[in-house]
């Protein structure tokens, strides 16, 4: 859980000829305020589309009116923050919707009269618990500057919210695979326990006791393989039941990218790729120059010195798209260790791992043989998240604490009787043979195939093997 | 701190041959996963278990190897296209005491002509 928080800080007119009329004048005074919703992943940005995030309204701002003959300034703006609380994780990718009403004071009847003055949109990434990012948005003529950020409510923490801080149990450290909360130095990650039966290679969770399922996958324990080969298309919602993909409309049909933009699909929704010049989600916005400062995430402008000739973000490394919008995918280098599910949250990578493992880049195998101990001088042998105790003669078992029985796989040859001896075992040979498990016979002149036995042991007398 | 120096690069014809290199130094670091990208997408690489990985689109064509410090990587690239011209990025999952860090190269011009 936590709070994505707003800043609005000016509202106005923007850079550039054709300055907009101002919204209120002195016969119809008004004031603003604004709303925004917010949508996780790569949704679409419709503004009838449920804000599945959560969204807020500001309160009002001054009383505005128009001093005439002077050009529209920066409008005054409500005081405070839009604050949207969220109950579960911070997906680090969101959607936004942003808009400026205006609330007309004049003589209406009925009371006052509302009207939507600018409306921006946007998707972009967020790691919670990290600095306030900055942003500047047009909408025609109008320009919105805001700030905003995602904090955690304790006791989660993390770039999601999804570790849980408590207090240490031990003073000195954290138990297995735990690390200490920071900035929380005192206090501890504390181990997230999904939905008992919750599959842990198809399976995993955000918050205690949910169990979400890796794509591919369905059931409530994600267990439950999604298969195609009976349906329709390959698109569309998963059924629970069925394990069965329904068809359904694709995101790019009809082609919602304008101005030349391409459109590909992505696991929740679509996204455009857009030529030189435009951006925004559907390649809406255009007439863009390097002085507008179209390049995100300190990317370089060329070029672009007028609204007619196409500007290029040379982007940082790290950062991809026209506009240096999209992050780069870390996680395609498979950073994780022994099967862990990457994550990548913008400003951390980080990685789910399979039962067994632990630490951050699932590195340490949980079950390996720190710490544990073969009995009765037998070793250790690591492999695969598991450990086996390679057992001495004469036992066996998981941890080798469990006599075995050494005539139980019926070592002796040729009808020998086997006796379980201290040291190992014995076999008493048939008539005929001879050896530590009568695997040799005594030829019919008296002489064996081995070497004379011992002083004192004539053939078919018991051979103690060990 | 850790450095990732790349050299090579540089302008060939199509169907030649290109070398890219790519170095980290620092202390007290060790290498989790490193490998290329280029326009945003992983070209090649070693992940985070050691296995190398490849791009579809050069698949066959390009070739990573690790040096015996194991903090190097170069991609060998043959049968060039044009359409490998691009800036081709060195990255490194690196572990620094006991956290992890991302790190970039600052970056090669590969150009292919037809």
């Known amino acids: 859980a936590g709070v994505f928080e707003l800043q609005i800080h000016s509202f106005g007119p923007g850079p550039g000829p054709g300055a907009p009329r101002s919204p209120c004048s002195a016969r119809l005074p008004c004031r603003l305020f604004f709303r925004v919703c917010l949508k996780p992943g790569l949704s679409e940005e419709a503004a009838e589309s449920p804000c599945a995030l959560g969204a807020a309204l500001s309160a009002r701002g001054p009383v505005y009116t128009e001093q005439p003959g002077a050009p529209a300034p920066d409008l005054p703006l409500p005081d405070g923050l839009l604050q949207v609380p969220f109950r579960d994780a911070w997906p680090g990718t969101f959607s936004f919707i942003i808009e400026t009403w205006r609330e007309e004071l004049g003589d209406q009847i009925g009371g006052p009269a509302w009207s939507l003055l600018a409306r921006v949109a946007g998707r972009r990434r967020l790691a919670a618990g990290g600095p306030w990012a900055r942003d500047i948005q047009r909408a025609g003529a109008w320009e919105l500057r805001f700030s905003y950020r995602a904090r955690c409510e304790p006791p989660a923490v993390g770039t999601a919210c999804t570790r849980l801080c408590r207090p240490r149990s031990a003073p000195s450290r954290c138990g297995p695979g735990l690390r200490p909360c920071a900035p929380l130095e005192d206090e501890c990650e504390a181990p997230l326990v999904c939905r008992a039966g919750c599959s842990p290679e198809h399976g995993f969770c955000e918050q205690p006791g949910e169990c979400r399922c890796l794509e591919g996958w369905t059931g409530p324990l994600c267990t439950v393989p999604v298969s195609t080969s009976s349906c329709l298309s390959p698109r569309g919602p998963s059924s629970a039941t069925t394990g069965c993909l329904v068809p359904g409309p694709g995101p790019c049909d009809g082609n919602p990218c304008a101005n030349g933009g391409s459109c590909s699909e992505t696991p929740r929704s679509f996204e455009c790729t857009c030529p030189r010049g435009f951006y925004g989600l559907r390649c809406e916005v255009s007439g863009v120059t390097c002085a507008d400062g179209p390049c995100f995430n300190g990317g370089l402008c060329v070029g672009g010195a007028d609204p007619d000739s196409a500007y290029i973000c040379h982007c940082p490394p790290g950062f991809q798209g026209s506009n240096c919008e999209k992050r780069v995918d870390r996680c395609s280098l498979q950073p994780c260790r022994n099967g862990g599910l990457c994550l990548d949250l913008g400003h951390a990578l980080r990685c789910r791992c399979r039962a067994g493992f632990a630490g951050p880049r699932c590195e340490h195998d949980l079950d390996d043989c720190a710490g544990r101990a073969c009995a009765n001088g037998g070793t250790c042998v690591e492999g695969g998240g598991a450990h086996r105790c390679s057992c001495a003669l004469g036992f066996g078992g998981r941890d080798c604490r469990e006599r075995a029985d050494p005539c139980a796989a019926r070592p002796c040859a040729h009808g020998g009787r086997c006796y379980a001896h201290f040291s190992g075992l014995v076999c008493a040979c048939a008539p005929g043979y001879m050896g530590a498990r009568c695997e040799f016979p005594v030829h019919p002149d008296g002489a064996s195939a081995l070497p004379a036995a011992p002083p004192g042991l004539r053939p078919g007398d018991p051979q103690r093997y060990l | 701190q850790v450095q990732l120096q790349q050299s090579g690069g540089g302008l060939v014809q199509a169907g030649g041959s290109l070398r890219l290199s790519c170095a980290a130094s620092?202390?007290?670091?060790?290498?989790?996963?490193m490998g290329w990208y280029r326009q945003g997408e992983l070209v090649a690489g070693f992940t985070g278990d050691g296995?190398?990985i490849y791009a579809d689109s050069v698949k066959g064509r390009f070739t990573i190897s690790r040096g015996n410090a194991e903090n190097t990587v170069s991609l060998q690239m043959n049968s060039l296209k044009p359409e490998d011209t691009a800036v081709y990025y060195c990255?490194?999952?690196?572990?620094?005491?006991?956290?992890?860090?991302?790190?970039w190269g600052q970056g090669t011009q590969v150009t292919v002509k037809p």
């Open positions: 990255a490194a999952d690196v572990k620094i005491g006991g956290d992890y860090e991302w790190y």
């Open positions: 620092g202390s007290d670091f060790s290498i989790n996963a």
């Open positions: 296995n190398p």
